[in-house]
């Protein structure tokens, strides 16, 4: 397993509709054709997997149908969007990138993006 640098923004504020987007960029040391991206959430010293997708370079990221994540890739950048967030989902969201194929296998873990989600003030038909 070889290390790889992964960069992501320090802080993102979710929209009032509970949507947060951020870019996860990795320094690919080779010509990977298969990449796996995983979003982890760290809160109260617990780390949980939020979503994951494997994609072939040049193709779209494919998350599971019921995933709260969507994403697109462009070169060594992955644009991630997480939806359905509410205040209790505030936490550190860590981007983990694995270059699966061809060998050698590379692993990179970002420092995390602190996503802040605010419960909006009550008003007619507002989003929670």
């Amino acid at each position: 397993c070889k290390a790889m640098h992964v960069a992501q923004p320090a802080v993102v504020l979710a929209s009032s509709r509970g949507i947060a987007s951020f870019v996860c960029e990795y320094a690919s040391p080779g010509k990977a054709t298969e990449v796996r991206v995983t979003v982890l959430r760290q809160a109260d010293s617990q780390v949980t997997e939020v979503c994951a997708a494997t994609y072939m370079m040049g193709n779209e990221l494919t998350f599971l149908d019921d995933s709260i994540c969507t994403g697109t890739s462009s070169g060594n950048q992955v644009n991630l969007t997480i939806q359905g967030l509410r205040a209790m989902d505030t936490g550190l969201y860590i981007c983990k990138v694995e270059l699966m194929y061809p060998p050698p296998y590379y692993l990179g873990i970002g420092n995390g993006t602190q996503i802040y989600v605010i419960d909006p003030e009550p008003c007619p038909d507002s989003d929670f």
């Epitope: 019921d66 709260i68 509410r86 205040a87 209790m88 989902d89 038909d125 989003d127």
Partner: antibody, heavy 123, light 107 residues
Framework: QVQLVQSGAEVKKPGASVKVSCKAS????????MHWVRQAPGQGLEWMGI????????NYAQKFQGRVTMTSDTSTSTVYMGLNSLRSEDTAVYYC????????????????WGQGTLVTVSS | DIQLTQSPSSLSASVGDRVTITCRVS??????LNWYRQKPGDVPELLIY???NFQSGVPSRFSGSGSGTDFTLTISSLQPEDVATYYC?????????FGQGTKLEIK
């Protein structure tokens, strides 16, 4: 085990107010949102609002704005739903139901419901 | 407001039949849809969350599918205890609207 225990049935006159309680146990109270849903006799389910027990933040269905108040008491792990200016069409069974953050592992929204509280509004 | 329209509003089927209930949403809600069963006189029980996830303890004859605006609840082999009213509900954000319900009876 997880339990949501609601207060007993109420009979109220039109124009009066009612306050229904929902006491939670068996899980971390402040880690889940709580919803209130009502069901008039022979009718479908109607979402009323949501409260964040940790912060007290609320959001109400437009239909109930100005008439409903949802609060929480973390010391007793209880949420309350108050409805004022009662009318006959408010006669219904009122339910509380918990809802985890979306990122909670194996967390399912509305997985546990209270047993329901019948509120009858009649002159 | 976002509307949820269930169809049919009622249906009668025989034990062992495959039953399908649909829920159409007026706006894209991704996969943020729940399905509930409410037996007569009972509290609603969660069957499926986020379109296709089984709630623990729910019989495997129940399954959910769909994304965006069109969702389906399928009962692969109808059982007598499935006599109930079924509701869909959006869980994306407030308001967490329910469909009007589908009443299922046994022939």
């Amino acid at each position: 085990q997880v339990q949501l225990v609601q207060s007993g049935a109420e009979v109220k006159k039109p124009g009066a107010s009612v306050k229904v309680s929902c006491k939670a146990s068996g899980y971390t109270f402040t880690s889940y949102y709580m919803h209130w849903v009502r069901q008039a006799p022979g009718q479908g389910l109607e979402w009323m609002g949501i409260v964040n027990p940790s912060s007290g933040s609320t959001n109400y269905a437009q239909k109930f704005q100005g008439r409903v108040t949802m609060t929480s008491d973390t010391s007793t792990s209880t949420v309350y739903m108050g409805l004022n200016s009662l009318r006959s069409e408010d006669t219904a069974v009122y339910y509380c139901a918990r809802d985890p953050p979306i990122t909670m592992v194996r967390g399912a929204p509305f997985d546990y419901w209270g047993q329901g509280t019948l509120v009858t509004v009649s002159s | 407001d976002i509307q949820l329209t269930q169809s049919p509003s009622s249906l009668s089927a025989s034990v062992g039949d495959r039953v399908t209930i649909t829920c159409r949403v007026s706006q894209d809600i991704s996969s943020f849809l729940n399905w509930y069963r409410q037996k007569p006189g009972d509290v609603p029980e969660l069957l499926i969350y986020r379109s296709s996830n089984f709630q623990s303890g729910v019989p495997s004859r129940f399954s959910g599918s769909g994304s965006g605006t069109d969702f389906t609840l399928t009962i692969s082999s109808l059982q007598p205890e499935d006599v109930a009213t079924y509701y869909c509900q959006r869980t994306y954000n407030a308001p967490y609207t329910f469909g009007q319900g589908t009443k299922l009876e046994i022939k």
